[in-house]
Amino acid sequence: FDLVDYEEVLGKLGIYDADGDGDFDVDDAKVLLGLKERSTSEPAVPPEEAEPHTEPEEQVPVEAEPQNIEDEAKEQIQSLLHEMVHAEHVEGEDLQQEDGPTGEPQQEDDEFLMATDVDDRFETLEPEVSHEETEHSYHVEETVSQDCNQDMEEMMSEQENPDSSEPVVEDERLHHDTDDVTYQVYEEQAVYEPLENEGIEITEVTAPPEDNPVEDSQVIVEEVSIFPVEEQQEVPPETNRKTDDPEQKAKVKKKKPKLLNKFDKTIKAELDAAEKLRKRGKIEEAVNAFKELVRKYPQSPRARYGKAQCEDDLAEKRRSNEVLRGAIETYQEVASLPDVPADLLKLSLKRRSDRQQFLGHMRGSLLTLQRLVQLFPNDTSLKNDLGVGYLLIGDNDNAKKVYEEVLSVTPNDGFAKVHYGFILKAQNKIAESIPYLKEGIESGDPGTDDGRFYFHLGDAMQRVGNKEAYKWYELGHKRGHFASVWQRSLYNVNGLKAQPWWTPKETGYTELVKSLERNWKLIRDEGLAVMDKAKGLFLPEDENLREKGDWSQFTLWQQGRRNENACKGAPKTCTLLEKFPETTGCRRGQIKYSIMHPGTHVWPHTGPTNCRLRMHLGLVIPKEGCKIRCANETKTWEEGKVLIFDDSFEHEVWQDASSFRLIFIVDVWHPELTPQQRRSLPAI
């Protein structure tokens, strides 16, 4: 769980390579866990700076530690997921709260404990990388402050929210154990995909996660994106945006949670003293204080909750999955005590769910969310969170049912709308998804101002020929989700040169280009031989990018890993490429043959990251009818010649020839990425 700089990680949860394979796939969502960065161009704040943190509740370990900026970012993140989860943010409140109603009878915790999440490894993140990466896939967001819970509760002291306008720095985050799925916007897909582990490679992981949790010493690096925090946990993004709409404000304000039962009121002074330490960032002292309170008053829900929060903070500070697992257990203990105030019960279980998601324990989180909904059946925000829980394990059908239920009761719930629209889009119900995505974003509700929703709304509109698409891309850009209207990738490192088309000289990879062009016939012949003898190695494009037609790919490298079986089919090509680490080591790209048959149209779409450039070597190019547009310039391929473009910019392909088109695609690291960044960025 070692953290990475918040800032660094913000937006980068890719770090969480649960299985250690360096994949950043599954949306890195998990990994990203909510890193919702605001603007691609914002400078990242150095991780160190991010550490101080005044928000007690925010003091979530990795998430909370950051400074304002980070906090915000975190918050954003948290917000995101959390918002996604619709966390009800309540304003800070003192321990002094009155007694709250006790939670409804709790069911046994066993169900929780049965969660099947196994891999709890928290790889350690290293704050070495400081690229601000802005990733916007749909993942669970890393929470920043101890979750809205904390925010919500913020009960004890009055803490200021971090400045929401500050850029978020790359954060270091804890890693997910990635035992499950997350939803993400991979390329164009509007699908919550299983988390594949995006991340950074873990060092020395010896045993299976269950038996051998990754030690805190293992280090993983992640990239981060930086955005000014937009959605703080307690405030919906729109609100942050300075809304004067009283209704909006009303939405945000909530009654203070009541966290003390009668007994805890009698020990309030002791609880306050311990909480003060936590809020001041004296985490180790606070851990001791709350630990002693639990020893002294084992039936005190508030003391137990304070201990959980301190462990949560400590986990973040130490970037330790191990400590975080302890916090998750302690949050559960709170819920199992007698006479727990309902607000405290809700906060504790919500935070538990959030931290489980953070660790990648999506199924365990789902069980926690199901329990919350059972305990608080009238709380719409919890149902929204439950929907996210289903999405994170790839159960879109149940998520859809949850959001249908929410919308039947509260038809204007923006959070439910965007998520419902997201699901419809994933189900290829393009036209149906548009009003939900659009109205959801327009609601300004917490959790709706997320790049993924702008991404899919615009894409849906483009696919039905609605020219409003670019209005939404423009708005997404203005709100910091996209680098520009054309460049809409979600996993970005800020500050990289951005242009749609590149010349070999501009890339600096002239030797690679020369080698490809000199050997194009060899490359072509091996590709044709595979087509002829092992056509099954060419797999159809499966990201729903085609309007029509037939398009398949034969991949030699992906995520920086050579496919040995594939290379048996194209051995000379693979040998040739081994000399060029800028491509074979590009963990955010692929090397593959791409065959497209006549009558194919690939919708305008955007790649996932600005960290790569894409080379296309023409191998078999029909005389007419094949073209590619990137941004606002259209080009054609030539046999034996390389075209280079940045696929983080919108691009579109047409194949209207009378015979197949075969090209060889070679992704390379963006030339401005440093060696350190290339080593540490999670795979995609």
Partner: antibody
Framework: QVQLVQSEGGVVQPGRSLRLSCAAS????????MHWVRQAPGKGLEWVAV????????YYTDSVKGRFTISRDNSKNTLYLQMDSLRPEDTALYYC????????????WGQGTLVTVSS | EIVLTQSPGTLSLSPGERATLSCRAS???????LAWYQQKPGQAPRLLIY???SRATGIPDRFSGSGSGTDFTLTISRLEPEDFAVYYC?????????FGQGTRLEVK
């Protein structure tokens, strides 16, 4: 590295008193709760007492309540166990031990001090 | 007071074999509060597992812990000669710490 060095034990007559000490080094003593655990010859481990990091809270196993007192001097990085009204059944090897910072388990142990209560 | 009962009292196995030691609590124990220790003759105990399943620093990965509620298990996947010792489970609850009576693991 964490070190817990215990004082010498000895033979004591029933009803008499003895004070054990444990000098800690290699860690921030005042951040940790500390325990005494004993082990009678040929027997298993038995927890005796714990004291909070700041000395404000103390807890004992039932069999020693009212007779034993755990204390600490954080300025000297030292833990004590004052044993009064000793009984033959208190004969054991006494271990000074450090509780983990955020858990309830013991992560470091002293070498042990043998206390023999016999007439 | 929670009573921990370990079984078997003595386990006789050969190096290379798998050892499974059980610890049963008289009432439910939070997994966060269950630990396992190893003690060799003439030495102080050594922490092996905490939080029911987390290995302490420096403990080989052949040692693993599992369980929840009232039933906990320590497993040594492949016994090494140095693993023959006495093993104790320990729990914390309501300001009281209790140890199991121990399981002696001896060479067959």
């Amino acid at each position: 590295q964490v070190q817990l060095v215990q004082s010498e034990g000895g033979v004591v007559q029933p009803g008499r008193s003895l004070r054990l000490s444990c000098a800690a080094s290699g860690f921030t003593f005042n951040d940790y709760a500390m325990h005494w655990v004993r082990q009678a010859p040929g027997k298993g481990l038995e927890w005796v007492a714990v004291i909070s990091y700041d000395g404000s809270n103390k807890y004992y196993t039932d069999s020693v309540k009212g007779r034993f007192t755990i204390s600490r001097d954080n300025s000297k990085n030292t833990l004590y166990l004052q044993m009064d009204s000793l009984r033959p059944e208190d004969t054991a090897l006494y271990y000074c031990a450090r509780e983990a910072s955020s858990g309830w388990y013991i992560d470091s142990w002293g070498q042990g001090t043998l206390v023999t209560v016999s007439s | 007071e929670i009573v921990l009962t370990q079984s078997p009292g003595t386990l006789s196995l050969s190096p290379g074999e798998r050892a499974t030691l059980s610890c049963r609590a008289s009432q439910s124990v939070s997994s966060s509060y269950l630990a396992w220790y190893q003690q060799k003759p003439g030495q102080a105990p050594r922490l092996l597992i905490y939080g029911a399943s987390s290995r302490a620093t420096g403990i080989p990965d052949r040692f693993s812990g599992s369980g929840s509620g009232t039933d906990f298990t320590l497993t040594i996947s492949r016994l090494e000669p140095e693993d023959f010792a006495v093993y104790y489970c320990q729990q914390y609850g309501s300001s009281q710490v209790t140890f199991g009576q121990g399981t002696r693991l001896e060479v067959k």
